[in-house]
Amino acid sequence: ISYDSPDYTDESCTFKISLRNFRSILSWELKNHSIVPTHYTLLYTIMSKPEDLKVVKNCANTTRSFCDLTDEWRSTHEAYVTVLEGFSGNTTLFSCSHNFWLAIDMSFEPPEFEIVGFTNHINVMVKFPSIVEEELQFDLSLVIEEQSEGIVKKHKPEIKGNMSGNFTYIIDKLIPNTNYCVSVYLEHSDEQAVIKSPLKCTLLPPGQESESAESAK
């Protein structure tokens, strides 16, 4: 591999590296390919110590257009020199390359969550994996957005320790018999574009008598 190949830009692939459920997922799309590959192989090396390209075992001859690199790419400081090969049968159709630096190239997908509406509060249950590697924490904070009648409120729950295991947050002081929508996302310490989850909505039941909710805030 030439790490300083001339300044050409006619790459035939578009790559995206995402943190999905706290796993590093590299996905790709093909541009202008008349023949669709039957399978792909992903290879990489590290820039600071360039060696022969290493095939990613679970992404060798794969038919998927994504690859889980959590167990391979452990450093947020390294640049990973990556090559994607596309095949049709035994014929190599193309080879695309790109360098990835997780600390700034990573985008953060929202975690899975559920909501349960009560008379004057909503329980938001956010699902995190049971174990999350320290290097995949990325100085992230969880944001829960509450929307009702055009008003958006941001909640930033304080999570003790790592984002791991399930986490419940109570949005309280709500108005009975009102429709509320909730979105969750992970916010980076910098103003990186966030990926918000689709809204989940609930119509709170009408109030019988005033209910009090212990806030988890």
Epitope: Y3, M47, E78
Partner: antibody, heavy 117, light 112 residues
Framework: QVQLQQSGPELVRPGVSVKISCKGS????????IHWVKQSHAKSLEWIGV????????RYNQKFKGKATMTVDKSSSTAYMELASLTSEDSVIYYC??????????WGQGTSVTVSS | DIVMTQTPLTLSVTIGQPASISCKSS???????????LNWLLQRPGQSPKRLIY???KLDSGVPDRFTGSGSGTDFTLKISRVEAEDLGVYYC?????????FGGGTKLEIK
């Protein structure tokens, strides 16, 4: 060979903004991030921030948030940094540098900014 | 932020003699990936900085082997075995383990 060509010196009035550029050549521009570094006599070298040339994601030194804005134009292989509300403290040399991961390797020749009324 | 402290401020050396610059960080620079992102730059008079050493001890291509980098954790050293005239300038250490990246104040190498 790898080159980072920065825009020429700037003489600007206090309170205005200035946008300086850094054009990469001799390598595939979107494979390397671009950092910006401030050099003053008083404070030696200070890291302003870094931008991903592929995605446009940024990391700023908290100290320069609101002062510096980094952008990138992939089509011209050029990174930009805009400095707002200039004061005499901003009269220094600004460098761009490229990096693969945390390792800055090549630096631009520097852009001198002078703020004077 | 990590504070990088370089000593001495100025180093006056006779050509052919050795030189040594110290760099101390306020926090360990060992990353969870097992690497230490401590680097050295040289800025010759009137020029932009040029990378000499990265990851504590790896020499950049074209850098003469009279330069050596060593250290771990918080204490690092740059040594020049025999100083040559082209070595004059300001040497900076900088760390890329923790955001924001930070630089030492610089050590000016003068030729006696």
């Amino acid at each position: 060979q790898v080159q980072l060509q920065q825009s020429g010196p700037e003489l600007v009035r206090p309170g205005v903004s200035v946008k300086i550029s850094c054009k990469g050549s001799g390598y595939r521009f979107t494979d390397y991030a671009i950092h910006w570094v401030k050099q003053s006599h008083a404070k030696s070298l200070e890291w302003i921030g870094v931008i991903s040339t592929y995605y446009g994601n940024t990391r700023y030194n908290q100290k320069f948030k609101g002062k510096a804005t980094m952008t990138v134009d992939k089509s011209s292989s050029t990174a930009y940094m805009e400095l707002a509300s200039l004061t005499s403290e901003d009269s220094v040399i600004y460098y761009c540098a490229r990096s693969g991961g945390s390792l800055m390797d090549y630096w631009g020749q520097g852009t001198s900014v002078t703020v004077s009324s | 932020d990590i504070v990088m402290t370089q000593t001495p401020l100025t180093l006056s050396v006779t050509i052919g003699q050795p030189a040594s610059i110290s760099c101390k960080s306020s926090q360990s620079l060992l990353d969870s990936d097992g690497k230490t992102y401590l680097n050295w730059l040289l800025q010759r008079p009137g020029q932009s900085p040029k990378r000499l050493i990265y990851l504590v001890s790896k020499l950049d291509s074209g850098v003469p082997d009279r330069f050596t980098g060593s250290g771990s954790g918080t204490d690092f050293t740059l040594k020049i075995s025999r100083v040559e005239a082209e070595d004059l300038g300001v040497y900076y250490c900088w760390q890329g383990t923790h955001f924001p990246y930070t630089f030492g104040g610089g050590t000016k190498l003068e030729i006696k």
